[in-house]
């Protein structure tokens, strides 16, 4: 055959869907890697073509659309299941052709098993709630397009094993999920149900995701450097190891970026001449504040090094804070001498 | 044996300001509750008032004609507090307090009312 | 603001028979109502939530169904005991203004002949 732009295995684009379930796929080619989308392909003569390979196999076939009651169709650039069944998994291709063109890509697909509780080797989105922050919805995931919107589906909302029906904080409003206030006790897997009906058939969409309740932007601060402080001198001799913490608190802010850097005398670490190290550990807390440390050591310090200025500094979406180290050389013990006169010369 | 009780109300001056009590006993508010209140005029039907959050910061929501004039406070491990300011004749009823283990429509729970009266 | 709206009021029905109460919301509330009896001097006493999940300790004559906007209350086989005002809440949020609306119906009054 011809040659044919191939974009190779897209695996940016792990699909997962649920066994048993309608899945609808569109052709990743006119999503990420060309410029134009379907319609504009097919008007200009150009057509869409799929096939796949099996799990653990090399050929590749192409995929049966006469399965009864249609199970595989396509539709436009949507590759639709109704349902899916295990052994649908595999790596499906769409391509784009006609005598002079031809462009191509491959996705893996994975039909995944989920149990009575919901839980599955999916990998779940992650939906951060603010803390006591009002009222805040999550929503079921990925249903567009699977029914039209004259067909009214019913949604059963569950967290783990439970149907959600007289949980004294949430309140499930169709595909919504409202938060009247959100609390700790609220993290966990929140799952959707939605099940709706097609020629004479009825089919159900299971989408589950992750709540996590996060510090509140109305509890939010700049920066809190608890280490270095003014209660705390690092008094060391010349040869002795200097090592000074900087521990810094930030709040919970999302898309925030959270920094810590030390000056030496004005300039970063890598900047001087000095045999200094920095090692960083970082913790959160249950509602993602974090606290990070970053230790200065100078294995062995000089006493020039006893006098620079070493500042710790913090940055986030909040705010930017330093606070200098006191450092200090020890002053050696004064030792006493006792000089006896002794034989004092007479003459 | 759980029970509500309300207390606090009485005859009042139009204009006139006054604070409802309920009481709990038989539980506390360490179990996250909504206490919340409702109103009936004598021979009407009821409304809702207000329900605050008894964990955490204590979340309060109140109806769209209540924010103003009403104020919905927990102020103590078994106590929440509601006072009323600018009462007028339209304030008569018998408050009810109610908590609810669900959200904030299932009161299974509820005191027997205290009458609060509006007049000169 | 939800506004719900109770019909018929008043009811009356005979021992045994059936009396069915409808309640219609303003606006979507999926499953989020809950249905009251009140006796006179009483507070209410909680029936069903959640539509149509049975409150703990309440007979089985007591029913609902619906969803969205449109709710019926069921008694089936009533009794004389079941004379009293019986009223629907709903409840909604609106996330734009942070606000939690609750509603009560007018209530309906079930004489028992």
């Known amino acids: 055959s011809e040659r044919c732009d191939d974009w190779g295995l897209d695996t940016m684009r792990q699909i997962q869907v649920f066994e048993d379930e309608p899945a609808r796929i569109k052709c990743p080619l006119f999503e990420h890697f060309l410029k134009f989308n379907y319609s504009t392909a097919h008007s200009a003569g150009l057509t869409l073509i799929w096939y796949w390979t099996r799990q653990d196999r090399d050929l590749e076939e192409p995929i049966n659309f006469r399965l009864p009651e249609n199970r595989i169709s396509k539709e436009k650039d949507v590759l639709w299941f109704r349902p899916t069944l295990l052994n649908d998994t595999g790596n499906y291709t769409c391509m784009l052709r006609n005598t002079t063109y031809c462009s191509k890509v491959a996705f893996p697909l994975e039909v995944v098993q989920k149990d009575s509780c919901f839980n599955s080797p999916m990998k779940l989105p992650v939906h951060k709630l603010y803390i006591e922050y009002g009222i805040q919805r999550i929503t079921c995931p990925n249903v567009d397009g699977y029914f039209p919107s004259s067909v009214k589906p019913t949604i059963t909302w569950y967290m783990g094993c439970y149907k959600i029906q007289n949980f004294n904080n949430v309140i499930p409003e169709g595909m919504n999920l409202s938060f009247l206030i959100a609390l700790i006790s609220n993290n966990g897997n929140y799952t959707c149900v939605v099940t709706y009906p097609e020629n004479g058939r009825t089919f159900h969409l299971t989408r589950t995701l992750t709540v996590k309740v996060v510090g509140s932007p109305k509890n939010a601060v700049p920066p809190v450097i608890h280490s270095p402080n003014d209660h705390v001198v690092y008094e060391k001799e010349p040869g002795e190891e200097l090592l000074i913490p900087c521990t810094v608190y930030f709040s919970f802010l999302m898309d925030s970026r959270n920094e810590v850097w030390w000056t030496i005398d004005g300039k970063k670490p890598d900047d001087i001449t000095i045999d200094v190290t920095i090692n960083e550990s970082i913790s959160h807390s249950r509602t993602e504040d974090e606290t990070r440390t970053q230790i200065l050591s100078i294995k062995k310090v000089t006493s020039e090094d006893l006098k620079r200025s070493y500042v710790c500094h913090a940055r986030s979406a909040k705010g930017e804070v330093a606070k200098a180290a006191k450092v200090k050389q020890k002053v050696p013990a004064p030792r006493y001498t006792v000089e006896l006169a002794c034989g004092f010369g007479a003459t | 044996q759980e029970q509500l009780v309300e207390s606090g109300g009485g005859l009042v001056q139009p204009e006139g300001s006054l604070t409802l009590t309920c009481t709990a006993s038989g539980f506390s508010f360490s179990s996250n509750y909504w206490m919340c209140w409702v109103r009936q005029a004598p021979g009407k039907g009821l409304e809702w008032i207000a329900c605050?959050?008894?964990?955490?910061?204590?979340?309060t929501y109140y109806a769209s004609w209540a924010k103003g004039r009403f104020t919905l406070s927990k102020t103590s491990s078994t106590t929440v507090t509601l006072q009323v300011t600018s009462l007028t004749a339209a304030d008569t009823a018998t408050y009810f307090c109610?908590?609810?283990?669900?959200?904030?429509?299932?009161?299974?729970?509820w005191g027997q009312g205290t009458l609060v009266t509006v007049s000169s | 603001a939800l506004m719900m709206t109770q019909t018929p009021s008043p009811v009356s029905a005979a021992v045994g028979g059936t009396v069915t109460i409808n309640c219609q919301a303003s606006?979507?509330?999926?499953?989020?109502l809950a249905w009251y009896q009140q006796k006179p001097g009483q507070p209410p006493k909680l029936l069903i939530y959640?539509?149509?999940t049975l409150a703990s300790g309440v007979p089985s004559r007591f029913s609902g169904s619906g969803s969205g906007t449109e709710f019926t209350l069921t008694i089936s086989g009533v009794q004389s005991d079941d004379a009293a005002t019986y009223y629907c809440l709903g409840v909604c949020t609106d996330i734009s203004v942070d606000d939690v609306y609750n509603s009560f119906g007018g209530g309906t009054e079930v004489v028992v002949k």
């Open positions: 959640s539509a149509s």
């Open positions: 109610a908590r609810d283990l669900v959200v904030v429509t299932s009161f299974n729970l």
């Open positions: 606006e979507d509330i999926y499953s989020n």
């Open positions: 605050i959050y008894t964990g955490g910061s204590g979340v």
